[in-house]
Amino acid sequence: VKMAETCPIFYDVFFAVANGNELLLDLSLTKVNATEPERTAMKKIQDCYVENGLISRVLDGLVMTTISSSKDCMGEAVQNTVEDLKLNTLGR
Amino acid sequence: EICPAVKRDVDLFLTGTPDEYVEQVAQYKALPVVLENARILKNCVDAKMTEEDKENALSVLDKIYTSPLC
């Protein structure tokens, strides 16, 4: 999925939270050097997803996917690509 | 780099009011079941998390956005 290419660690953390997978959340948080209080905070968010069940996780995942693939984001990605191409061309 | 629309969604989830967050979600997915779910999750997070927790969650997000993996 294109959205994960823009900031893979964000989507790793988001889907670990939303899926209720504490182990994957811990691993993802290690990758960004999260402190213990930061881990505790993220696990409180995770608890909300777990308590509200599978449908809740699916629906919120759908929202995140929809936002990430919206014209607001895809337009941004295209614009960034254009800017990168301009810079690369100028750099030659 | 993270898309600003995603960043806004996450920021409102943590720091906005339930109405502000649901309004933001509605711009992208206006299904009643989705909006009800968004409100339930937002209310849960507000009930569970102290202001300090929210600051810590925002700190994690900052680490994510500035990570080489983003």
Partner: antibody
């Protein structure tokens, strides 16, 4: 001082079952993910499984998936690895290890030997 | 699954020598790599985490470097107690895998 003490190893026939335990002390057990790593005689290290601290999310190596189960009792500071449908290639020393941040095995037990043979 | 390779598989060096071991991943793992020492008949011991961070209590003669797919572990001045097998391990994602190990002994 952090201590991890494995038990439950022994000789078992192919197809048989065994339950390994790991008693932990010297740290806040529920705050840490934990793992099992095994080492076949004369061979290298192989990660087997990890479990998260509070809710017990687990991941397994493909080689043991569907045959091993990993659980923890935070009230007893104890881990359990249930081994079933055992094969000769499961013969190894099984180490339990503390997994800091679910990523670094920073403390290890002394290991318990599991031998699968007829 | 990510494969880890190590070289050499074994080496002999004199006390005081600088010893270097390399570890290679078959895909980019950023700096998500640890190094362990296992002395004969003992459990492994964490030396280096996140490619270059020295674990608390580990002598400063041990160091690690690298990022992406290529990593290096160095003992700046080999001591008799460093006789052991050294393993790298990635934590990019599950399943975690270890390198096959490098056996170090004294000439």
């Amino acid at each position: 001082e952090v201590e991890l003490l494995e038990s439950g190893g022994g000789l078992v026939q192919p197809g048989g079952s065994l339950r390994l335990s790991c008693a932990a002390s010297g740290f806040t057990f529920s705050s840490y993910a934990m793992s099992w790593v095994r080492q076949a005689p004369g061979k290298g290290l192989e990660w087997v499984s990890s479990i998260s601290g509070r809710v017990g999310s687990t991941h397994f190596a493909d080689s043991v998936k569907g045959r091993f189960t990993f659980s923890r009792d935070n009230s007893k500071n104890t881990l359990y690895l249930q081994l079933s449908s055992l094969r000769a290639e499961d013969t190894a020393v099984y180490y339990c290890a503390r997994s800091r941040g679910a990523a670094y095995f920073d403390y290890w037990g002394q290991g318990t030997l599991v031998t699968v043979s007829s | 699954d990510i494969q880890m390779t190590q070289s050499p598989s074994s080496l002999s060096a004199s006390v005081g020598d600088r010893v270097t071991i390399t570890c290679q991943a078959n895909q980019d793992i950023s700096n998500f790599l640890n190094w362990y020492q296992q002395r004969p008949g003992k459990a492994p011991n964490l030396l280096i985490y996140a490619a270059s961070n020295l674990e608390t209590g580990v002598p400063s003669r041990f160091s690690g470097s690298g990022s992406g797919t290529d990593f290096t572990f160095t003992i700046s001045s080999l001591q008799p107690e460093d006789i052991a097998t050294y393993y790298c391990q990635h934590y990019d994602n599950f399943p975690f895998t270890f390198g096959p190990g490098t056996k170090v002994d004294i000439k």
